[in-house]
């Protein structure tokens, strides 16, 4: 597995990571850490593993966390109720 750097699919990344679109260069994907408590997220970001090519810059939240709305159009990783 690729621990950091370029990737195409989740299976190429290490545990606790997903293959998300680079914030800097949208044409490449990089192994990115899954969302920690308080991190920004999107509720429709693909769960891990996803076999296709992601479009979001963010990964889903870590297990035990959920991507919850905190205000209009703002979502963060919070502890699941």
């Amino acid at each position: 597995a690729v621990i950091t750097g370029a990737c195409d699919k989740d299976s190429q990344c290490g545990g606790g990571m997903c293959c998300a679109v680079s914030i800097w260069v949208k044409s490449i994907r990089i192994c990115t850490p899954m969302g920690k408590l308080g991190d920004s997220c999107h509720p429709l970001t693909r769960k891990v593993p996803f076999f296709g090519r992601r479009m979001h810059h963010t990964c889903p939240c870590l297990p035990g966390l959920a991507c919850l709305r905190t205000s209009f159009n703002r979502f963060i990783c919070l502890a699941q109720k």
Epitope: L44, T45, R46, F50, G52, R54, M55, H57
Partner: antibody, heavy 121, light 111 residues
Framework: EVQLVQSGAEVKKPGASVKVSCKAS????????MHWVRQAPGQGLEWIGY????????TYNQKFKGRVTITVDKSTSTAYLELSSLRSEDTAVYYC??????????????WGQGTLVTVSS | DIVMTQSPDSLAVSLGERATINCKAS??????????MNWYQQKPGQPPKLLIY???NLESGVPDRFSGSGSGTDFTLTISSLQAEDVAVYYC?????????FGQGTKVEIK
């Protein structure tokens, strides 16, 4: 060649349940999610929900929550939609649709031929 | 739920002329600088067919006379030179928020 072949038309009484099948072929079934969409006669499209054919995780339109169940049988590469407590307004053509490799664009690139479900007393 | 409103409900365009369909979302369907809007074509008696995904990306095999544009709440599907085989109903669909919702459809006919 990717194909989604759905079960035949159904006529049901109000309050009954219906189960529609969608048999996939021509691709690796577990690598793609499957959506269900319906279309009432002469009306537009309405998204019902989808399932991961890899692990069976489902996401439903809240409008149908409690009445709809989407399942898969990986051994036969078949997806199922079950809708209970049928009412006349559930009369529609029900489509299964494979979600293509578009990440979070959730775009459906192959569709079944549709199954007409008629709810009538 | 996000409400998608298409305009016009129907339009008649001469062969070879441009057809423009608009879709307005009740709230933004953008995220991370991308627009989460798809367009489908449905001919009578057939299932829908994917034309455009993520607002402006042409699906493989779709003629390049079709194009999509827009961001935020306002989107457009353009057929640059209408052909007879383009007679159909066209639907926009947002996929930025669950439930995914479709517009009511726009019927395109030949004048």
């Amino acid at each position: 060649e990717v194909q989604l072949v759905q079960s035949g038309a159904e006529v049901k009484k109000p309050g009954a349940s219906v189960k529609v099948s969608c048999k996939a072929s021509g691709y690796s079934f577990t690598d793609y999610d499957m959506h269900w969409v319906r279309q009432a006669p002469g009306q537009g499209l309405e998204w019902i929900g989808y399932i991961s054919c890899y692990n069976g995780a489902t996401t439903y339109n809240q409008k149908f929550k409690g009445r709809v169940t989407i399942t898969v049988d990986k051994s036969t590469s078949t997806a199922y939609l079950e809708l209970s407590s049928l009412r006349s307004e559930d009369t529609a053509v029900y489509y299964c649709a494979r979600e293509g490799n578009y990440g979070e664009a959730y775009a459906m690139d192959y569709w079944g031929q549709g199954t007409l479900v008629t709810v009538s007393s | 739920d996000i409400v998608m409103t298409q305009s016009p409900d129907s339009l008649a365009v001469s062969l070879g002329e441009r057809a423009t369909i608009n879709c307005k979302a009740s709230q933004s369907v953008d995220y991370d600088g991308d627009s989460y809007m798809n367009w489908y074509q449905q001919k009578p008696g057939q299932p829908p067919k994917l034309l455009i995904y993520a607002a402006s990306n042409l699906e493989s095999g779709v003629p390049d006379r079709f194009s999509g544009s827009g961001s935020g709440t306002d989107f457009t599907l353009t057929i640059s030179s209408l052909q007879a085989e383009d007679v159909a109903v066209y639907y926009c669909q947002q996929i930025n928020e669950d439930p995914f919702t479709f517009g009511q459809g726009t019927k395109v006919e030949i004048k």
